[in-house]
């Protein structure tokens, strides 16, 4: 038995489990998912059995190999995978562990403004990103750019502080998790902050 | 100093295959998007298609799809397209790009290596 | 896809002109544009992203503007080294697309 192996896999997509045995004599060979049976192949009779229907055409195993694909993931595909290997000139069966975490291609970030401030003509509010849907594992990173600076702030909340006759700042909130990358509209600073400008001491949403 | 080296080019026969190599080197391979680019002779830019860090996500130009395959070993620090089907018109210089900071935009490119399909 | 149009395809100039090149993308892609300078016999070098942004070491007679779909690099004063194709790229949708160059030559 080796060590746990992670794969990655996009919803959609397909990801292969590989497997290499020394085994000389298999009689056969279980995949599980989450403790429930998978797939069984007899190498012998050239037999698979595919547990439950609606995985029949997702499961394949390429080059004639023990290998497994599994194709058109889905989120709930993300879980713990074991396989066995039986032979009878072993005591005990050869087993390999995965994990499969199973993301979500990302759509556009969105971007929303908390309490705004204008003091002494700088407009001072948080803008926060977020994935609509609720996505895990998102790491999010803001781009702040203009003449004065091209910076990157991680986190979904950025602080901005902007003073008006100031040159105009754009910011763009970048979203990625393992397997996609997107990023949200930009937002400039001198709309973002006109709200506030006739009122030096107005607070709003 | 960050490089990336391509290599593999050559001439080939239509109909042929052929697989490039990009070395890569003076950064941490394994936590960029890679993306392949070629130029035909005279010609513009021609996104190809990029794979994400862990192999799990491949985009590709829709027209090129069904021929080329672009795969990577983080292990070997390679990134590789394997072309199948060439012609006449897949003759070009083909690049491997990094993009800055693992946005969209590419700041490291490698030399290019010269595919020819010719009879 | 999203088609790039870069005019004029190719043009010249004298030394210490200024040098506009307009790129045109077919739909919306706010500000999701890269240009690039391609020297005779060389490879690419990013010079601009997100439609305005420099990049590093990048002199500061490049510049660029635009969103949407009408974006412009402007050179404020043409130097000799400056002579290449440039191509912008918008990254907004794939398969991310590039414009078919402009050439600049010195009169």
């Known amino acids: 038995s080796g060590p746990v192996k992670e794969l990655v896999g996009s919803v959609g997509g397909a990801v292969t489990f590989p497997l290499k045995s020394k085994v000389k004599q298999v009689d056969s060979i279980v995949w599980t998912f989450n403790t429930t049976p998978l797939v069984t192949i007899q190498p012998e009779g050239g037999t698979i059995i595919v547990t439950q229907n609606r995985n029949r055409e997702r499961v394949d195993f390429p080059d004639g190999g023990y290998s497994l694909k599994l194709s058109k993931l889905k989120k709930n595909d993300s879980g713990i995978y074991y396989v066995g290997i039986y032979s009878s000139s072993l005591q005990q069966p050869s087993t390999q562990e995965y994990v499969l975490h199973v993301y979500e291609h990302l759509s556009k970030p969105k971007v929303t403004m908390g309490l705004q401030s204008n003091k002494n003509g700088t407009c001072v509010t948080n803008l926060t990103c977020c994935m609509e849907h609720g996505e895990e594992d998102v790491i999010y990173t803001w781009k702040a750019l203009g003449q004065a600076a091209n910076e990157s702030h991680n986190g979904s909340i950025l602080p901005i502080s902007w003073r008006w006759g100031e040159s105009d700042m754009t910011f763009i909130c970048v979203a990625r998790n393992p397997v996609s990358r997107n990023f949200s509209s930009p937002i400039l600073a001198r709309k973002l902050c006109e709200g506030a400008a006739d009122d030096p001491d107005s607070s709003m949403v | 100093e960050v490089q990336l080296v391509e290599s593999g080019g050559g001439l080939v026969q239509p109909g042929g295959s052929l697989r490039l190599s990009c070395a890569a080197s003076?950064?941490?391979?394994?936590?960029?998007?890679m993306s392949w680019v070629r130029q035909a002779p005279g010609k513009g830019l021609e996104w190809i298609g990029e794979?994400?860090?862990?192999?799990?996500?491949?985009n590709y130009t829709p027209s090129l799809k069904d021929k080329f395959i672009i795969s990577r070993d983080n292990a070997k620090n390679s990134l590789y397209l394997q072309m199948n089907s060439l012609r006449a018109e897949d003759t070009a210089v083909y690049y491997c790009?990094?993009?800055?900071?693992?946005?969209?935009?590419?700041?490291?490119w490698g030399q290019g290596t010269l595919v020819t399909v010719s009879s | 896809d999203i088609q790039m149009t870069q005019s004029p395809s190719s043009l010249s100039a004298s030394v210490g002109d200024r040098v506009t090149i307009t790129c045109k993308a077919s739909q919306d892609v706010g500000i999701a544009v890269a240009w690039y300078q391609q020297k005779p016999g060389k490879v690419p070098k990013l010079l601009i992203y997100w439609a305005s942004t420099r990049h590093t070491g990048v002199p500061d007679r490049f510049s660029g503007s635009g969103s949407g779909t009408d974006f412009t690099l402007t050179i404020s004063s043409l130097q000799p080294e400056d002579v290449a194709t440039y191509y912008c790229?918008?990254?907004?949708?794939?398969?991310?697309?590039f414009g078919q160059g402009t050439k600049v030559e010195i009169k």
């Open positions: 794979i994400n860090p862990d192999s799990s996500t491949i």
């Open positions: 790009a990094r993009p800055d900071g693992n946005y969209w935009y590419f700041d490291v």
């Open positions: 003076g950064f941490d391979f394994s936590r960029y998007w």
């Open positions: 790229q918008q990254y907004s949708s794939y398969p991310y697309t």
